[in-house]
């Protein structure tokens, strides 16, 4: 006899990276007929929803209207059908950004390079942090982690046209509290014409929308739960 129900999916909308004082919604999707959903934060009960009518609802939304460092951390959810509880969802790491200071991102030898050249990004922040994160804008949300007292190196090695795109970095005060994003650095990698045409740049945010990047749902990242659970969260483990 089944002792538990399948685990629900959990994700954040519009994004798991939330600027301080902005709103975020934590979504938990279970099964139709679930009479209760519970959201747990850092291992303790945070909120409860008992949807009505339960047979017509399979997803609930927990709003956090004012993101701050106390609300950043690990969330999970469970649901109940009758007296039977589900397995807990995967952990959702909610990160608060725009904390304290803004790092500086630079690239060596420069932002315009030839395919095959070795490229290194440098992220610098003169405040108390030793962990840095380099993000390439775009649906794939590539994230690299680096360490250093005031600066971290991110060697990309010999680059290809697949590396071209817009990069930003963050200083990380802890796993769930990040700095403001750096100004963007656009890496242009030139190669032979055939290669360039076969390796289009990742889809990116328009240049003027990064400041509100968390207000733009990244459909590919947010809705594909398997991808969400497997990649975007792994950097925080």
């Amino acid at each position: 006899q089944q002792q538990t129900l399948p685990k629900p999916f959990i994700w954040a909308e519009p994004h798991f990276m939330v600027p301080k004082e902005k709103q975020v919604t934590i979504c938990c999707q279970g099964n139709y007929g679930a009479v209760e959903y519970q959201l747990h934060f850092e291992g303790s009960l945070f909120a409860v929803d008992r949807p009505k009518p339960p047979e017509r609802i399979n997803k609930v939304q927990f709003y956090i209207p004012d993101m701050n460092s106390r609300m950043a951390g690990q969330y999970s959810c469970i649901y109940r059908v009758g007296e039977l509880w589900s397995e807990p969802s995967n952990l959702l790491d909610l990160v608060v950004t725009e904390m304290y200071d803004t790092p500086t991102l630079s690239v060596h030898p420069g932002p315009e390079v030839i395919s095959g050249e070795k490229v290194t990004f440098y992220c610098r922040l003169d405040t108390a942090t030793s962990m840095f994160l380099l993000l390439k804008e775009g649906r794939s949300s590539h994230v690299q982690r680096g360490y250093g007292k005031v600066q971290a190196e991110f060697p990309l090695g010999p680059v290809t046209t697949a590396h071209r795109g817009t990069y930003r970095c963050f200083g990380s005060y802890n796993n769930h509290a990040w700095s403001f994003p750096s100004e963007p650095v656009k890496l242009l990698v030139t190669g032979d014409i055939e290669n360039t045409s076969l390796a289009p740049e990742d889809p990116t945010f328009p240049a003027d929308t990064w400041g509100t990047y968390l207000l733009t749902t990244e459909t590919g990242l947010q809705k594909d739960h398997a991808l969400w659970d497997h990649t975007a969260q792994n950097l925080l483990r």
Epitope: S44, A47, D49, Y63
Partner: nanobody
Framework: EVQLVESGGGLVQPGGSLRLSCAAS????????MAWFRQAPGKGLEFVAA????????YYADSMKGRFTISRDNSKNTAYLQMNSLRAEDTAVYYC???????????????????????WGQGTLVTVSS
Amino acid sequence: EVQLVESGGGLVQPGGSLRLSCAASGRTFSRLPMAWFRQAPGKGLEFVAAISWSGGSTYYADSMKGRFTISRDNSKNTAYLQMNSLRAEDTAVYYCAAVGDSAPYSATIVYTDARAYAYWGQGTLVTVSS
């Protein structure tokens, strides 16, 4: 901006009853989930009960179930905590709290964690003693 003022606290004998009130100012109160918390002398803040903005959903700490009842009257911008069968260990300062007011909350959601609450009253003291 929401202001909360509790009243109804006082001295009561074990086994007795009290009804606490939480009067809110601010137009958004009727759309906000809210809760009661308490803090006993020398102890941390403890969740007591929570209610959805519609009043249709409630949730209680295990030790309060069956003895305490949370309710609200949105037409009066007031929430209540009816406390029956009071015990000495219920002695505490009782606080009402409301969540932040910039989100469209589900009519059935309640928040049990103090970190979810943006607005707090000044508290009312309940003393249970013979």
